[in-house]
């Protein structure tokens, strides 16, 4: 039975040209996390694998940085970065947990972050 829950940064906004930290946190399970995938719609941004470490997709290597922790940092944001982002936790024996973040990239300085999210 899957007992875990994923907390995320939720709905967030940022300014064009700026950067944003995407963060998820899996709790309430003792399952072993074997891999975390970060995806934008159907595109793979990055993977953190327990045995192999981090891999950033080549098409994003200039704009994506690993961390903080198992999170992901997106830089040089464009309005095309607006959309859904998913953190996908592959665990054993529970299976897959998925968290969703919606990012809106704004042209002007009206960007406002959603609820503040702190890793314990």
């Amino acid at each position: 039975m899957m007992t875990g829950t994923i907390e995320t940064t939720g709905n967030i906004s940022a300014e064009k040209g700026g950067s944003i930290i995407l963060q998820c946190h899996l709790s309430s399970t003792t399952a072993q996390v074997t891999q975390v995938n970060w995806e934008q719609q159907d595109q793979l941004l990055a993977i953190c694998n327990a045995d192999l470490g981090w891999h950033i997709s080549p098409s994003f290597k200039d704009r994506v940085a690993p961390g903080p922790g198992l999170g992901l940092t997106l830089q040089s944001l464009t309005v095309n970065d607006t959309g859904e982002y998913f953190c996908i936790y592959h665990t054993y024996p529970d299976g897959t947990y998925t968290g969703r973040i919606f990012l809106e990239v704004l042209e002007s300085s009206v960007a406002e972050h959603g609820a503040r999210f702190q890793i314990p």
Epitope: A31, V33, T34, Q35, G53, G67, P68, G69, L70, Y92
Partner: nanobody, 120 residues
Framework: EVQLVESGGGLVQPGGSLRLSCAAS????????MGWFRQAPGKEREFVST????????YYADSVKGRFTISADNSKNTAYLQMNSLKPEDTAVYYC?????????????WGQGTLVTVSS
């Protein structure tokens, strides 16, 4: 349990330098990435720099490129952030964060933070 210990913060004049260090200790098999993030009073936590342990790829925020250099000593499980040409706007609490692998899978951890004040 994995722990991060940060050191090297302090008061420095504009144009000066500081070197931060972040050391991981505890029970883990490998560090996957380690990096620095900062938070100024009343502002969101922001990305500064990270280093990918596998491949030693380094990543920097645009605001610190050319001034800050991140490096790692794998044998000591320690990352360093050399900060040169410091500006008053670099004043913040600097947090270290890391992703790691252990016998229980992937995990991540934050340090307690070290204060950097740039002022004349």
């Amino acid at each position: 349990e994995v722990q991060l210990v940060e050191s090297g913060g302090g008061l420095v004049q504009p144009g000066g330098s500081l070197r931060l260090s972040c050391a991981a200790s505890g029970t883990f098999q490998r560090i996957n990435a380690m990096g620095w993030f900062r938070q100024a009073p009343g502002k969101e936590r922001e990305f500064v720099s990270t280093i990918n342990w596998s491949g030693s790829n380094t990543y920097y925020a645009d605001s610190v490129k050319g001034r800050f250099t991140i490096s790692a000593d794998n044998s000591k499980n320690t990352a360093y952030l050399q900060m040169n040409s410091l500006k008053p706007e670099d004043t913040a609490v600097y947090y270290c964060a890391s992703s790691y692998s252990s016998s229980s899978g992937l995990g991540d951890i934050w340090g307690q933070g070290t204060l950097v004040t740039v002022s004349s």
